[in-house]
């Protein structure tokens, strides 16, 4: 168990002309609040899918009126950190976003109104217990500074939080066949001992026999990886060698939903239903009201006064969930063959095809990279009947073996501005473009000419694409 | 007490490679960026790069991009930086620096004692 | 990468006078600057963090100022054991990068 902390440190324009204008007046002054969505693994997931690793809601920051003729500084900012508390293992990869609203606190009619500024997202790595890692993205001509880490509860230490720490009980040395707990010299590991043959990679024990599979991975010593491709039914078929779930514990078992949440099966996963009060992927969040701003994508809120009566989300078309968090999901059908990602761009589906496949919805089978390496943990890319490397930062050339400045390929278009990062190269796009490399046109209308955006993001909205 | 303790002076013929550690003592060694900086004599401060000592992760300054790598041993809180190919004007004193808790980039708030590397045939 | 630029590259003073340096950067880092005193043969000792924030254990007579892309270190009654080479840092990019250094000498 451990906590996911977040640190916003600026949000404003960024660098380079054509500066975004104040997002508040003198006649609608505004304040500022985050919200992060956690999800584990490194999947391109769509920005409406469950905040499987936790969700959390800044406070408002404090009310800002822009001054007449005034480029926008940045923008004041909430105090304190976003902490998103985990139960389990802290997965060790992630994919985050960061949306940035603006609460409008003019005379409206039935309170403030709130509109999405900006999101951001993005797939990391990052070990538990280590220092802050720092990062800057760019969404439109907003720029989104922020920091983030994984910290232990303890007795949990590691890269992962799951070992277990205990302070010595003599002062001199830990018990037979126990270890310093490395980083706290003063205390020794605790004698958990798991289910004999747990993978040691992939499983972990909170209690002495257990064996707890991290994501992606089952069977009763964690060592088959999952697929859900080819299972039956859902839990997946008992045979453990195709790689489906084993029947066996369900994802309702303990029961994941706090605060006395009823939790019911999904065929995907779970779903808690909350009481009064609290809501949450696992009803973790406590005392919200509509004050609290809980319904999201222009959702209106109703009810709720105070934080023992429930209050409801009146979501827009487009959106359900008890707080408007999902998008209504037209992927459902799974039209992507091949393990492609759906994308709903609202005017249409998209498929994006996994490495060696091809097509409006990845049926036509490439196979460019059999046979071909990449050095220095670059991955074949594969696609027009040739090979090509992902070479990892610091690397270049056509089989990853040359040393290499990330920006020295001039990677951002349209006269973007590289910069090198530890997290990979960022790019500070010239006015009138966005993206990554800063790849896309930004038209005059505000729409995007996005071959391929994330659902849940609608043409115009502010957002950087990894 | 946080201390940074640096190995001892070296002296190498140029096209060698010198590897300098620096052992850190009295805090979480994992939860803190180590630095690398170095000063040619009579010179000003060089800043070589960064480690993170949780996951081995670095970050080095665009000129000695292919010539430095950085490691850690965390079984014994000790980082290590390697400069290869060495030149006579990689002879400096070369600094280990840990640099302070903020959750931005931060500055360093405790060095070790320097290392001089000489280099000459 | 941002540029520092310090100045004066050196200066003369005698005990007891207000000194003080300037350090500009190439490009807006805020408050994220840090100043260092080296004396010959001793590694760097950080005195100012974050602009203007003092480093625990260092006397007052030192002083920080400035955001954005002009920075001073005051010291304000310089004492003997203040003749020193001073160094600012910025810190605002993952690429941290030092000014030349100012050299203090006595009068």
């Known amino acids: 168990a451990g906590v996911f902390e977040l640190q916003i440190h600026s949000f404003g324009p960024g660098p380079g002309p054509g500066a975004p204008r104040s997002p508040c007046s003198a006649r609608l002054p505004c304040r500022l609040f985050f919200r992060v969505c956690l999800k584990p693994g490194l999947s391109e997931e769509a920005a409406e899918s469950p905040c499987a690793l936790g969700a959390a809601l800044s406070a408002r920051g404090p009310v800002y009126t822009e001054q007449p003729g005034a480029p926008a500084p940045d923008l004041p900012l909430p105090d304190g950190l976003l902490q998103v508390p985990f139960r389990d293992a802290w997965p060790g990869t992630f994919s985050f976003i960061i949306e940035t609203w603006r609460e409008e606190l003019g005379d409206q009619i039935g309170g403030p109104a709130w509109s999405l500024l900006a999101r951001v997202a993005g797939r990391r790595r990052l070990a538990a217990g280590g220092p802050w890692a720092r990062d800057i993205q760019r969404a439109g001509a907003w720029e989104l500074r922020f920091s983030y880490r994984a910290r232990c509860e303890p007795p949990a230490v590691g890269t992962a939080c799951t070992r277990l720490c205990r302070p010595r009980s003599a002062p001199s040395r830990c018990g037979p066949g126990l270890r310093p707990c490395a980083p706290l010299e003063d205390e020794c590991e605790a004698p958990l001992v798991c289910r004999a043959g747990c993978s040691p990679e992939h499983g972990f024990c909170e209690q002495p026999g257990e064996c707890r599979c991290l994501e992606g991975w089952t069977g009763p010593l964690c060592t088959v990886p999952v697929s859900t491709s080819s299972c039956l039914s859902p839990r997946g078929p008992s045979s453990a060698t195709t790689g489906c779930l084993v029947p066996g514990p369900g994802p309702c078992d303990g029961n994941p939903c706090a605060n006395g949440g009823s939790c019911s099966e999904t065929p995907r996963s779970f779903e808690c239903t909350c009481p009064r009060g609290f809501y949450g992927l696992r009803c973790e969040v406590s005392g919200v009201t509509c004050a609290d701003g809980p319904c999201f994508n222009g959702g209106l809120c109703v009810g709720g006064a105070d934080p023992d009566s429930a209050y409801i989300c009146h979501c827009p078309p487009g959106f359900q969930g008890s707080n408007c968090e999902k998008r209504v999901d037209r992927c459902s059908l799974q039209p992507c063959r091949n393990g492609g990602l759906c994308l709903d761009l609202g005017h249409a589906l998209r498929c994006r095809c996994r490495a060696g496949f091809a097509g409006p919805r990845c049926e036509h089978d490439l196979d460019d990279c059999a046979g071909r390496a990449c050095a220095n943990g670059g991955t074949c890319v594969e696609g027009g009947g040739a090979h090509r490397c992902s070479c990892a930062l610091g690397f270049g050339g056509r089989d990853c073996r040359e040393r290499a400045d990330p920006c020295a390929a001039r990677p951002c278009a349209h006269g973007g501005r590289c910069y090198a990062h530890f997290s990979g190269l960022v790019c500070a796009c010239a006015p009138g473009y966005m993206g990554a490399r800063c790849e896309f046109p930004v038209h005059p209308d505000g729409a995007s000419a996005l071959p391929a955006a994330p659902p849940g993001l609608r043409p115009g909205d502010p957002q950087r694409y990894l | 007490q946080v201390q940074l303790v640096q190995s001892g002076a070296e002296v190498k013929k140029p096209g060698a490679s010198v590897k300098v550690s620096c052992k850190a003592s009295?805090?979480?060694?994992?939860?803190?960026?180590m630095h690398w900086v170095r000063q040619a004599p009579g010179q000003g401060l060089e800043w070589m790069g960064w480690?993170?000592?949780?996951?081995?992760?670095?970050s080095y300054a665009q000129r000695f991009l292919g010539r430095v790598t950085m490691t850690r041993d965390t079984s014994i809180n000790t980082v290590h930086m390697e400069l290869s190919r060495l030149g006579s004007d990689d002879t400096a004193v070369y600094y280990c620096?840990?640099?302070?808790?903020?959750?931005?980039?931060?500055?360093?708030?405790?060095w070790g004692q320097g290392t001089l590397v000489t280099v000459s045939s | 990468d941002i540029q520092m630029t310090q100045s004066p590259s050196s200066l003369s003073a005698s005990v007891g006078d207000r000194v003080t340096i300037t350090c500009r950067a190439s490009?807006?880092?805020?408050?994220?600057l840090g100043w260092y005193q080296q004396k010959p043969g001793k590694a760097p000792k950080r005195l100012i963090y974050?602009?203007?924030s003092l480093q625990s254990g260092v006397p007052s007579k030192f002083s920080g100022s400035g955001s954005g892309t002009e920075f001073t270190l005051t010291i304000s009654s310089l004492q003997p054991e203040d003749f020193a080479t001073y160094y600012c840092l910025q810190h605002d990019s993952d690429l941290r990068t030092f000014g030349q250094g100012t050299k203090v000498e006595i009068k």
């Open positions: 009295g805090y979480t060694f994992t939860g803190y960026y």
């Open positions: 490009q807006g880092i805020r408050n994220y």
């Open positions: 620096a840990r640099e302070d808790d903020s959750s931005w980039y931060g500055s360093f708030d405790y």
């Open positions: 974050a602009a203007s």
């Open positions: 480690i993170n000592p949780n996951s081995g992760d670095t």
